[in-house]
């Protein structure tokens, strides 16, 4: 399986909220002995490779922000901890999962990574990640709403 990032760049005004998204692309093994662990973290372009460094998002580690479930289930973090930091990660039945960040500040700018671990019991873990950039802007040059740039091209879309 692979992880797709529909958008590689999100440009948002300060104070806005943004939802960063990743999509799990098949084939996905939905057997009894396969489980998925999904999470989010901040990173850099990489000492070893992009997303190999794991930094907290608003002081919450990848452990705090994880989603867990088998291949068929939807999941959501409704932890008070995440909510208190203006964060919420969620996953649907169709392989899409996201993290929503409210009340953006300039400090939220940076590289974000989604990580999917396919746990094949008796075999190994298979890790796949996706990376995307968030730029939070302030002042007269900032957009009125988040503008997203698709990964495949530089055409932008405005999210209202």
């Amino acid at each position: 399986f692979k992880v797709a990032t529909p958008y590689s760049l999100y440009v948002c005004p300060e104070g806005q909220q943004v939802t960063l998204t990743c999509r799990l692309l098949g084939p996905v093994d939905k057997g009894h002995d396969v489980t998925f662990y999904k999470t989010w973290y901040r990173s850099s372009r990489g000492e070893v490779q992009t997303c190999s460094e794991r930094r907290p998002i608003r002081q919450l580690t990848f452990q705090d922000l994880h989603l867990h479930h088998g291949g068929h289930q939807a999941a959501q973090t409704s932890h008070d901890l995440a909510q208190r930091h203006g964060l919420e990660s969620a996953s649907d039945h169709h392989g899409q999962f996201s993290i929503t960040m409210r009340n953006l500040t300039l400090l939220d700018s940076g590289l974000y990574c989604c990580l999917v671990v396919e746990i094949r019991h008796h075999h190994s873990e298979h890790r796949v990640h996706g990376a995307m950039e968030l730029q939070v802007q302030t002042g007269k040059d900032a957009p009125s709403n988040c503008v997203v740039y698709p990964s495949s091209s530089q055409d932008s879309e405005q999210i209202t």
Epitope: Y37, S52, Q63, I119, S124
Partner: antibody, heavy 117, light 107 residues
């Protein structure tokens, strides 16, 4: 703050079954691997196996024929059974939480088990 | 099974000195390697995961590097509480295995 506590007999006779329980407090037993690791006196660490919160297990091939790990989510406990023990199974037994794609981040304090008649 | 070989077996240093510990894998483990510290009578404590990510609450004097088969744990300036045994552990596949350990002792 998640804490782990091992419990069980400290002395087991050869050929009998070693049984230990690990109680998880201060957090959920969901979404992690729950492992057993042992350390013979003066030696290094050996991973015995894990149970995932979903009930799936994975054992070290060197011990697989003798090991059973089970979980009771209602009690936030997981257990180790090691059959047909010999003196070579004398060790400190640790339970630990293992995070997917990470490492053993929380350990119990360990319990010494001596195999002797 | 992946075999991890740690060297040296014992490292004799003084407080304030730099400690460099090595871990070599029998085959590539990518960067899926962790380091632990163990003091006498205590459980191991996670220091580093994925070769260079410090675990929560670990001081900046501990750093990890490497990928593939060769890894290093560096303690930039030894504090009295750092004298202990250090283990590396791989998680690229099961069974999970540990190195034999390096004892860092006071010179």
């Amino acid at each position: 703050q998640v804490q782990l506590q091992e419990s069980g007999p400290g002395l087991v006779k050869p050929s009998e079954t070693l049984s230990l329980t690990c109680t998880v407090s201060g957090g959920s037993i969901s979404s992690y691997y729950w492992s057993w690791i042992r350390q013979p006196p003066g030696k290094g660490l050996e991973w015995i196996g894990y149970i995932y919160y979903s009930g799936s297990t994975n054992y070290n091939p060197s011990l697989k024929s003798r090991v059973t790990i089970s979980v009771d989510t209602s009690k936030s406990q997981f257990s180790l059974k090691l059959s047909s023990v010999t003196a070579a199974d004398t060790a400190v037994y640790y339970c630990a939480r293992d995070i997917p794609a990470s490492a053993f981040d929380i350990w119990g304090q360990g319990t010494m088990v001596i195999v002797s008649s | 099974e992946i075999v991890l070989t740690q060297s040296p077996a014992t490292l004799s240093l003084s407080p304030g000195e730099r400690a460099t510990l090595s871990c070599r894998a029998s085959q590539s483990v990518s960067y899926y390697l962790a380091w632990y510290q163990q003091k006498p009578g205590q459980a191991p404590r996670l220091l580093i995961y994925d070769a260079f990510n410090r675990a929560t609450g670990i001081p900046a004097r501990f750093s990890g590097s490497g990928s593939g088969t060769d890894f290093t744990l560096t303690i930039s300036s030894l504090e009295p509480e750092d004298f202990a045994v250090y283990y590396c552990q791989q998680r690229i596949n099961w069974p999970l295995t540990f190195g034999g350990g390096t004892k860092v002792e006071i010179k």
